[in-house]
Amino acid sequence: CDLPQTHSLSNRRTLMIMAQMGRISPFSCLKDRHDFGFPQEEFDGNQFQKAQAISVLHEMIQQTFNLFSTKDSSATWDETLLDKFYTELYQQLNDLEACMMQEVGVEDTPLMNVDSILTVRKYFQRITLYLTEKKYSPCAWEVVRAEIMRSFSLSANLQERLRRKE
């Protein structure tokens, strides 16, 4: 399965929406900066079969959706932008799910690397714990927004390789 061109466009739109969501100058939140340990190796795509890469991307986007659809998130971000953000994430999840359904028929393909799924989950656990520790402060959300933007940019490289991969 090849991810459609619209998938890459949706990813770019997601990044643009996240950029627009910023309400506070990042410079005023420097003291709140945190290294969440983005699992770059899970998004390099070299050791992956395509089906496994798709399931890792799906997990990342699904966790992002859940992170930004909490009550605390709704109280922080502009509602119109959040709705647009959800729409783009759903589009990407649908694209990936369509691909996953096709991969089911491919024999001898491990459909998921469970350790990679767990690694992505742990990355989002670190983000969630940071937010709860900081009591969901505006600066904490700003730090998380910047982190998710960064993670989407890094994962976009894998998505692009998947789109072109035969």
């Epitope: 699904q62 859940n66 989950r121 989002f124 656990q125 969630t128 714990l129």
Partner: antibody, heavy 119, light 108 residues
């Protein structure tokens, strides 16, 4: 509010199969992995496995791979677990629990289904 | 798999007494993924403490959790009747996820 509804009890014969259900409400079903946990009378908890309702992929505890099969029906927002070749060892309460992160990990459980295997 | 051993299996405490339940892991568990659940007879488990030391919503402040690596504990600063229950530790640091065998806490 988040709710997971499970039937109270199932009585089954040795060697037979049973399909347990877990109906979700109060949240977007496809957004969270659903887990299944076994508890034998007066004993600890055992994690059986999990399923992502969004795409149906599963992760199993090796100890249950030949015993349990996890599925979902998105249209009825219900998760299922089929247990096969039942023996007295399978007599237990089976819970479904919703995944999540931080304070939401296993924060929501079904009431459990008591499976009794008896001739 | 990571085996979680809880001790004691059963214990009794008087009202007002300080209680400590322990959970020992067969190999190291990251504290972010160590949880505790409370269960009363005939009910499903309830999330009690998440990520080693954070109290779940509605859990009384007399409860606390601590630990790292292979050694974790749940402490009740002053036992109350409503705390009588079984407590299970749980890890999701690695597959397969595991639970301890539980400590049944009774009131004297």
């Amino acid at each position: 509010q988040v709710q997971l509804q499970q039937p109270g009890a199932e009585l089954v014969k040795p060697g037979a199969s049973v399909k347990l259900s877990c109906k979700a409400s109060g949240y977007t079903f496809t957004n969270y992995w659903m887990h299944w946990v076994k508890q034998r009378p007066g004993q600890g908890l055992e994690w059986i496995g999990e399923i992502n309702p969004s795409h149906g992929r599963t992760i199993y505890n090796e100890n249950f791979k030949s015993k349990a099969t996890l599925t979902v029906d998105k249209s009825s927002i219900t998760a299922f677990m089929q247990l096969s070749s039942l023996t007295s060892e399978d007599s237990a309460v089976y819970f479904c629990a919703r995944g999540g992160l931080g304070p939401a990990w296993f924060a929501y459980w079904g009431q459990g289904t008591l499976v009794t295997v008896s001739a | 798999q990571i085996v979680l051993t809880q001790s004691p299996a059963i214990m009794s405490a008087s009202p007002g007494e300080k209680v400590t339940l322990t959970c020992s892991a067969g190999s190291s568990v990251d504290s972010s993924y160590l949880y505790w659940y409370q269960q009363k007879p005939g009910s499903s488990p309830k999330l009690w403490i998440y990520s080693t030391s954070n109290l779940a919503s509605g859990v009384p402040a007399r409860f606390s959790g601590s630990g790292s690596g292979t050694s974790y504990s749940l402490t009740i600063s002053s036992m109350e009747a409503e705390d009588a229950a079984s407590y299970f530790c749980h890890q999701w640091s690695s597959y397969p996820f595991t639970f301890g065998s539980g400590t049944k806490l009774e009131i004297k």
